[in-house]
């Protein structure tokens, strides 16, 4: 038994372009929380299939505002670890997946809303009671940096957590055979239940007599290195089991750089030049496969066949994000023509179109006038989705059916009288008042507010222009 | 509803292109990805390619130095173009449109055969 | 690519009997992308499921879909006149997009 601690050390913008916008505003403040999903071994198992080794789901991180115009910088983390107990042996090889999440804290109808920002996979060889592993995962344009390790609960120790240790029976030493349990060193190793020479370091077991091997390492006692290349060290003596050489001990002897990468000795360590595909002080460091089922909501997964080639998702319409992970307003575009009401039903779009208009985007302009006769001479307008007549004189009403009294919006001004004509009206103006609709006071000297009397009359005749 | 029309020659002569088009009625060309699939006489279903109003394509790798995908929309319609064809190119050519809800095919065309014979 | 495998490749039953059929992927379909389609002769497919379980739009509930990673199952609890098809799977996790080669149900 045990537990695999994850600590995250930055969640932020990647290096390169594009840096993506803050997922959070000052309309939207949000905070970031993280879930992590183990399963043992290196098999390709689906993004969906059960986290085995455990799962945990971390604190709720500070409340982030972002600063308008300013790039997104490293988000506020939740405080503290994240632990996945794990009852059994500690495997020697898992698979993880990091998630991470933004709670929106809007003004959310029904709570906070929770979408997914950034999700990580890989795969990774871990002894337990080892040094934390640090690790940096890029999602898009998002990078995540953490560090991890798994450790034993006592009462027990070693690579796999399957020797156990008791409380010295003796104050000063261990009884025979038995050797005191680093890091405690006050206690003493169980007597071993394992086959009898199964490697401490390398095997382990479950039941009394048997001796099984972690991943890389073989053989009836667990002893032999499994050779994932003929012999990669000049130095050593030859190994009759292999018959390779053993690891001397030099930095690079055992090629310590993982998938791949070639090792080369340096003044003080050793460095490794990693495969594309791969980077960490190691190489340890893996991309994203599209069988890690990288893309979400429908996301189709193209190319990333294998870690060399990068995967991309294709997002179905609706959704967006390196993983497709973020929801769009598809309303915002506003894709109704028209006028026309946007419904986006998650399946589909619809446009519920104004009167007039037609067609899936309200694209189409009905033809207002088709079919539609204005009567009395009238004629057909089309307009704003509507049809409407412009009558002849003397009638009126939607379709100029109506007689219209031209009267009776009483049009002569100044107490004018007003009189329907077949051709209109006739405007019999008051004394001192002029003008097709008596608009014009006649000036008391007998001069006129008009340009010119027109020719014909003077000023002061009765007025009855058309 | 979605509705979606093939059209183009039933007869192509071996190394020439085959060229059809599809018409798309009841949506807009812009809310989809459309896609091209096939079937040889008595036989499976083959996706050919698929494209997106902005442009994004993706093609069967087998057919891909031969396919052409292309949009138009203002006319509401996208073309399929295969170069160099064969008499296993002899096929029901279907147009069909990938959900909102992931990349499979919602809505189909009836169906076009293009027989690819000299 | 991810190969589907369809079996039997032809299911003789008569109306009222149950159908089930299989279809096994090469590697694990990611999410559960998976659909099914019903071909008639001289028709185009029809859209049955999505996301293995999803049941589209106007399909009968006599037909379920189920499974996920590799395996994946369609069964029509009764069978009707009109069910009798070629019944299609397609993945749409990971490109290329890729179908199953078919299982005929005929009446017996």
């Known amino acids: 038994a045990g537990v695999f601690e994850l600590q995250i050390h930055s969640f932020g913008p990647g290096p390169g372009p594009g840096a993506p916008r803050s997922p959070c505003s000052a309309r939207l403040p949000c905070r970031l929380f993280f879930r992590v999903c183990l399963k043992p071994g290196l098999s390709e198992e689906a993004a969906e299939s059960p986290c085995a080794l455990g799962a945990a789901l971390s604190a709720r991180g500070p409340v982030y505002t972002e600063q308008p115009g300013a790039p997104a910088p490293d988000l506020p983390l939740p405080d503290g670890l994240l632990q996945v107990p794990f009852r059994d042996a500690w495997p020697g090889t898992f698979s993880f997946i990091i998630e991470t999440w933004r709670e929106e804290l809007g003004d959310q109808i029904g709570g906070p809303a929770w979408s997914l920002l950034a999700r990580v996979a890989g795969r990774r060889r871990l002894a337990a009671g080892g040094p934390w592993a640090r690790d940096i995962q890029r999602a898009g344009a998002w990078e995540l940096r953490f560090s991890y390790r798994a450790r034993c609960e006592p009462p027990a120790v070693g690579t796999a957590c399957t020797r156990l240790c008791r409380p010295r029976s003796a104050p000063s030493r261990c009884g025979p055979g038995l050797r005191p349990c680093a890091p405690l060193e006050d206690e003493c190793e169980a007597p071993l239940v394992c086959r009898a020479g199964c490697s401490p370091e390398h095997g382990f077991c479950e039941q009394p007599g048997e001796c099984r091997c972690l991943e890389g390492w073989t053989g009836p006692l667990c002893t032999v290195p499994v050779s994932t290349s003929s012999c990669l060290s000049p130095r050593g003596p030859s190994s009759a089991t292999t018959g390779c050489l053993v690891p001397g001990p030099g930095p690079c002897d055992g090629n310590p750089c993982a998938n791949g990468g070639s090792c080369s000795e340096t003044p003080r360590s050793f460095e490794c030049t990693c495969p594309r595909g791969f980077y960490g002080l190691r190489c340890e460091v893996s991309g994203v496969t599209c069988a890690d089922g990288p893309c979400f909501n429908g996301g189709l997964c193209v190319g990333g066949a294998d870690p060399d080639s990068a995967y991309i998702c294709h997002c179905p319409p609706g959704f967006q994000g390196s993983n497709c992970e973020k929801r769009v307003d598809r309303c915002s575009l506003q894709p109704c023509r028209n006028g026309g009401l946007c419904l986006d039903l998650g399946h589909a779009l619809r446009c519920r179109c104004r009167a007039g208009f037609a067609g899936p985007r309200c694209e189409h302009d009905l033809d207002d006038c088709a079919g539609r006769a204005c009567a009395n001479g009238g004629t057909c307008v089309e307009g704003g989705g509507a049809h409407r007549c412009s009558c002849a004189l003397g009638f009126g009403g939607r379709d100029c059916r109506e007689r219209a009294d031209p009267c009776a919006a009483r049009p002569c001004a100044h107490g004018g009288r007003c009189y329907a004509h077949f051709s209109g009206l006739v405007c019999a103006c008051a004394p001192g008042y002029m003008g097709a609709r008596c608009e014009f006071p006649v000036h008391p000297d007998g001069a006129s507010a008009l340009p010119a009397a027109p020719p014909g009359l003077r000023p002061g005749d009765p007025q009855r222009y058309l | 509803q979605v509705q979606l029309h093939e059209s183009g020659p039933g007869l192509v002569k071996p190394s020439e292109t085959l060229s059809l088009t599809c018409t798309v009625s009841g949506a807009s060309i812009s809310s989809y990805y459309w896609s091209w699939i096939r079937q040889p006489p008595g036989k499976g279903l083959e996706w050919i390619g698929y494209?997106?109003?902005?442009?994004?394509?993706n093609f069967n790798p087998s057919l891909k130095s031969r396919v052409t995908i292309s949009v138009d929309t203002s006319k509401n319609q996208f073309s399929l173009r295969l170069s160099s064809v064969t008499t296993a190119d002899t096929a029901v050519y279907y147009c069909a449109n990938l959900a909102l809800t992931g990349f499979h095919f919602d809505y189909w065309g009836q169906g076009t055969l293009v027989t690819v014979s000299s | 690519q991810i190969v589907l495998t369809q079996s039997p490749g032809t299911l003789s039953l008569s109306p009222g009997e149950r159908a089930t059929l299989s279809c096994r992927a090469s590697?694990?379909?990611?999410?559960?992308?998976l659909a099914w389609y019903q071909q008639k002769p001289g028709q185009a497919p029809r859209l049955l499921f999505y996301?293995?379980?999803n049941r589209a739009t106007d399909i009968p509930d006599r037909f379920s879909g189920s499974g996920s990673g590799t395996d994946f199952t369609l069964i029509i609890s009764r069978l009707e006149p009109e069910d009798f098809a070629v019944y299609y799977c397609q993945q749409y996790g990971i490109s290329p997009l890729t179908f199953g080669g078919g299982t005929k149900v005929e009446i017996k």
């Open positions: 590697q694990s379909v990611t999410r559960g992308y």
């Open positions: 996301g293995a379980s």
């Open positions: 494209i997106y109003y902005s442009g994004t394509t």
